[in-house]
């Protein structure tokens, strides 16, 4: 037999199908010019010492072969003895290691078999009524195709599906969309209406994420507030990576899950912007404010479920950092300024009330005064901190108040509002004899004592009504009792108590008169 002809003899090896999983497959045959034809196939398995034979049987039942040697592609002309105008059946037999492996047969009319391309270029993927829609441009001069897809998940083998006939310059396919696993798709095409025409190669993989992005399973920790009034949010556990099918591992555009961090600063509600969304890889520094943090996972089909945490406010207080002066026109606060052109947010709320009831005020950008202090003033009419109760005050600062992650905490402290000097006056002052020359003075705690760090001390004043001599005794803010000694029997005394803050002297309580009775010996 001549090498250019199909040899109508028995092939030079025994006819036996090994039935093994390896061997030739994906045989495709088509016309490549007016009188020339090509068949190509793939071979799976070790290729050393393999000889391929292209078998062809005519409808009469007569069969022939082409010897291809080690090649997996063979061309022949319409003069090779193969009927090109009538239906023929072709397959490949590969002789290797003393056994024959056979490809699946293809039955076709060679003259009408055109080489079809798989979808080339960009395959657009979208979601349509719970299904996956793929769309691509029909390859040039190939309108009219039958299209198949195959798909697999990380844990399942390929499954074949049909896209149906296509007859336009764009083609599309509806495919199943998995809820929770990524999929790899490939598409192939063949000529429509040409009985037995060969399938194209499979397209490049199309990697598709699950409909629902995986719920982020992450944990955060927040560091201590630093000297700069900021604390770092750190990720303790990275989100789990999506498992990908074999063909999507490595670079798999389409299956990416993006995790975003959404910060909501709960404190200082009067600022311009309360929320900010960041990439999860870029962990922010936060002020000592309270925040809600959400991690949102999303893929090309949109956002998934999110995971949320509450980061409580840092309640570490610095009682000495804030100076408050109360004048006839109103109240002014002073604190060490942070830098030039800073905007400050002063937030206050009555102690013991829900955090949602905080009030705040935003200052215009201000530079430090000559003493290096920043200030905030308000009039009595404004009603700010006007009630005689304990307020928790936090001051935040930012050079860029519109950027949520650039706020820092300047200080947190307590302040007693209203007329603190009068409101703090101790009540229920009582005097009890203690010894022949001493008495014990007791009083009810000042309202100022409910405000941590505000009450600096009590002062107990004792006045000798005869000599008009006055003595004052400082008492620790935690104490509500003092012993006055060195008193003389029969002398009238008055005692008063006041409560002082660091910046304000209190108002004396009502004078309480007492005397030590003269003891008469028997």
């Amino acid at each position: 037999c001549r090498t250019s002809e199909c040899c109508f003899q028995d092939p030079p090896y025994p006819d036996a199908d090994s039935g093994s999983a390896s061997g030739p497959r994906d045989l495709r045959c088509y016309r490549i010019s007016s009188d020339r034809y090509e068949c190509s196939w793939q071979y799976e398995g070790p290729t050393a010492g393999v000889s391929h034979f292209l078998r062809c049987c005519l409808s009469s039942g007569r069969c022939c072969y082409f010897a291809a040697g080690s090649a997996t592609r063979l061309q022949f002309s319409d003069q090779a003895g193969v009927s090109v105008l009538y239906t023929v059946t072709l397959w490949v037999e590969s002789w290797a290691r003393n056994q024959t492996e056979k490809s699946p047969e293809v039955t076709l009319q060679l003259y009408n078999s055109v080489k079809y391309e798989p979808p080339l270029g960009d395959i657009k993927v979208s979601k349509l009524a719970g299904q996956l829609r793929m769309e691509w441009e029909t390859p040039d001069n190939q309108v009219g195709a039958e299209v198949q897809f195959r798909h697999r998940t990380p844990s399942s083998p390929w499954k074949l599906g049909d896209c149906g006939p296509q007859d336009d310059d764009t083609e599309s396919c509806l495919c199943p969309l998995e809820m929770n696993v990524a999929q790899e798709f490939q598409l192939r095409r063949r000529q429509l209406g040409s009985q037995g025409s060969s399938w194209s190669k499979w397209s490049s993989p199309v990697c598709v994420p699950p409909e629902n992005p995986p719920q982020p399973q992450v944990r955060f920790s927040v560091e201590q507030l630093g000297q700069d009034g900021r604390r770092r949010l750190t990720l303790k556990e990275q989100p789990t990576q999506l498992e990908l099918p074999e063909g999507c591992q490595g670079l798999a555009p389409g299956t990416e899950v993006t995790y975003r961090l959404q910060l909501h600063m709960l404190s200082c509600p009067c600022k311009a912007k309360a929320t900010r969304t960041l990439h999860l890889g870029k962990m922010p520094y936060l002020s000592g404010a309270a925040y809600n943090v959400a991690v949102i996972s999303s893929n090309q089909f949109g956002p998934g479920l999110n995971q949320t945490w509450h980061i409580p406010a840092d309640t570490h207080t610095e009682p000495v950092a804030l100076n408050i002066s109360v004048g006839t026109n109103g109240t002014t606060m002073y604190w060490p300024a942070r830098a030039q052109s800073m905007t400050y947010c002063i937030e206050w709320q009555p102690v013991g009330q829900d955090g949602g009831l905080a009030t705040c005020s935003l200052t215009a950008p201000q530079d430090p005064d000559p003493a290096g202090m920043a200030t905030y003033s308000w009039s009595r009419e404004s009603g700010a901190m006007g009630q005689e109760k304990c307020y928790y005050i936090t001051i935040f600062a930012s050079a860029h108040p519109e950027k949520l992650t650039l706020w820092s905490t300047v200080l947190s402290t307590y302040h007693f509002g209203g007329n603190a000097s009068a409101a703090g006056t101790p009540h229920h002052v009582s005097v009890k004899n203690h010894s022949l020359d001493s008495v014990s003075v007791d009083w009810a705690p000042s309202l100022l004592s409910t405000c941590p760090g505000v009450l600096k001390e009590y002062v107990v004043r004792c006045r000798d009504e005869d000599s008009k001599q006055v003595s004052e005794h400082p008492v620790q803010p935690t104490e509500t009792q003092v012993t006055l000694s060195g008193l003389r029997a029969g002398v009238a005394y008055t005692v008063q108590v006041r409560a002082d803050t660091a910046w304000l002297r209190g108002v004396w309580s009502q004078p309480q008169r007492f005397s030590i009775e003269v003891q008469v010996s028997d």
Epitope: D15, D17, G19, R55, G61, W91, K102, E105, V106
Partner: nanobody, 115 residues
Framework: EVQLVESGGGLVQPGGSLTLSCTAS????????MGWYRQAPGKQRELVAA???????NYADSVKGRFTISRDNAKNTVYLQMNSLKPEDTALYYC?????????WGQGTQVTVSS
């Protein structure tokens, strides 16, 4: 090893029907075209009907319109539905791979059409 087991033959009156089955093993059934062949006494074996991998069929002129070949790849089985049987359909019926028929032939199944 290739094995082909035919069944379903029998005695039937002219105009009657029969369905033959052939179960194959030892090769990848879904990858091969299959055929039904018959051999009457004193005659050569002839191809009656064939079916390709893709399900396309063709028939000998003498049986067109009366016989139908089909396949079930899940069961590795090929069928021949024979209607309007005639006495000249009497023969031993075999199935085999279509291209080229193997050296392995089953024992066949006898179909006799007689009144």
């Amino acid at each position: 090893e290739v094995q082909l087991v035919e069944s379903g033959g029998g005695l039937v009156q002219p105009g009657g029907s029969l369905t033959l089955s052939c179960t194959a093993s030892g090769f990848r059934f879904s990858d091969r075209s299959m055929g039904w062949y018959r051999q009457a006494p004193g005659k050569q074996r002839e191809l009656v009907a064939a079916i390709t991998v893709g399900g396309s069929t063709n028939y000998a002129d003498s049986v067109k319109g009366r016989f139908t070949i089909s396949r079930d790849n899940a069961k590795n089985t090929v069928y021949l539905q024979m209607n309007s049987l005639k006495p000249e359909d009497t023969a031993l019926y075999y199935c085999n791979r279509r291209y080229p028929p193997d050296d392995y032939w089953g024992q066949g199944t006898q179909v006799t059409v007689s009144s």
